[in-house]
């Protein structure tokens, strides 16, 4: 939920935003709603549809330390407990990741579960 | 599973305040969003706010802006809801229930507070 | 707010009948509408959540459909303990708000 004051020439001092709501799908152009005492709003707004939302913003995980390197496959890998939600974001209650076990070489991490579908 | 205990009955003086107690067991109690919800005698459901308890975020109905105050407490598992300067029409069952958008969610057992003078 | 309008105010069947529910909203939701049934003195159980998913624990006979602005909650059979008041209820936008309900008598 966003706060904004307003200055310029307005009754309204605060107005609250409520969440961007895409127009079709999940993600995509959309519309944000305002309150402000009796008055309410309506702007266009975007939730981005890149795979670093999806992941990253819809469910945020706690992580334990990485573990040991596996041998056999060259990666380590961590368990993520969920910690937060979007309210509609059906999340996995854990996730685990990998990585590569050289710190040398730069590559992203990859997410072995990410947001479940029931 | 999740377990929502809720604190006991209330009644209150018009103008006093209250303040309604969940507590969680079983599943993480920090993870999911906790809604309160009301029913006055013989109506419908009304969604009051909702906070999460890992960040504390709270969004509230505007209509309760300035009835209901939400608040947690991670130490011990346990969601409050505040009501303030109380009136008739604030007599009702509240309810807490644990919301998560993957399995559903769970509901206390509500709590009954009446505001008589 | 989004407006959810229940339909009808109260539907009388006999065990073992089919039973359509409907619920309506003001705009568009998606899939963003839950399911609700309620029993005197009881605290609400969910049904259905995002209009056609199903919930553990919840019988077969109970099924939802949706996306858009006209949502149905379905039970194929009617038993005896189905008896209830069943509400909907949107989580697309704040505030999240219920519909009416919807009184399911015996006949």
């Known amino acids: 939920k966003k706060k904004e004051k307003v200055k310029k020439g307005s009754e309204c001092s605060e107005w609250t935003w409520g969440p961007c709501t895409p127009s079709s799908k999940d993600c995509g152009m959309g519309f944000r709603e305002g309150t402000c005492g009796a008055q309410t709003q309506r702007v266009h707004c975007k939730v981005p549809c890149n795979w670093k939302k999806e992941f990253g913003a819809d469910c945020k995980y706690k992580f334990e330390s990485w573990g040991a390197c596996d041998g056999s496959t060259g990666t380590k890998a961590r368990q993520g407990t969920l910690k937060k939600a979007r309210y509609n974001a059906q999340c996995q209650e854990t996730i685990r990741v990998t990585k590569p076990c050289t710190s040398k070489t730069k590559s992203k991490t990859k997410a072995k579960k990410g947001k479940g579908k029931d | 599973q999740v377990q929502l205990v809720q604190s006991g009955a209330e009644v209150k003086k018009p103008g006093a305040s209250v303040k309604v107690s969940c507590k969680a067991s079983g599943q993480s109690f920090s993870s999911y969003w906790m809604n309160w919800v009301r029913q006055a005698p013989g109506q419908g459901l009304e969604w009051i706010g909702m906070?999460?308890?890992?960040?504390?975020?709270?969004i509230l109905n505007q209509k309760f802006k300035d009835k209901a105050t939400l608040t947690v407490d991670i130490s011990t598992s346990t969601a409050y809801m505040e009501l303030s300067s109380l009136r008739s029409e604030d007599t009702a069952v509240y309810y807490c229930?644990?919301?998560?958008?993957?399995?559903?969610?769970?509901w206390g057992q509500g709590t009954l507070v009446t505001v008589s003078s | 707010e989004i407006v959810l309008t229940q339909s009808p105010a109260t539907l009388s069947l006999s065990p073992g009948e089919r039973a359509t529910l409907s619920c309506r909203a003001s705009?568009?939701?998606?899939?963003?509408l839950h399911w609700y049934q309620q029993k005197p003195g009881q605290a609400p159980r969910l049904l259905i959540k995002y209009a056609s998913q199903s919930i553990s624990g919840i019988p077969a006979r109970f099924s939802g459909s949706g996306p858009g602005t006209d949502f149905t909650l379905t039970i194929s059979s009617v038993e005896p303990e189905d008896f209830a008041v069943y509400y909907c209820q949107q989580s697309n936008s704040w505030p999240l708000t219920f519909g009416g309900g919807t009184k399911l008598e015996i006949k």
């Open positions: 229930s644990s919301w998560s958008a993957k399995r559903g969610d769970f």
């Open positions: 705009e568009s939701i998606s899939n963003n």
């Open positions: 906070i999460h308890p890992s960040d504390s975020e709270t």
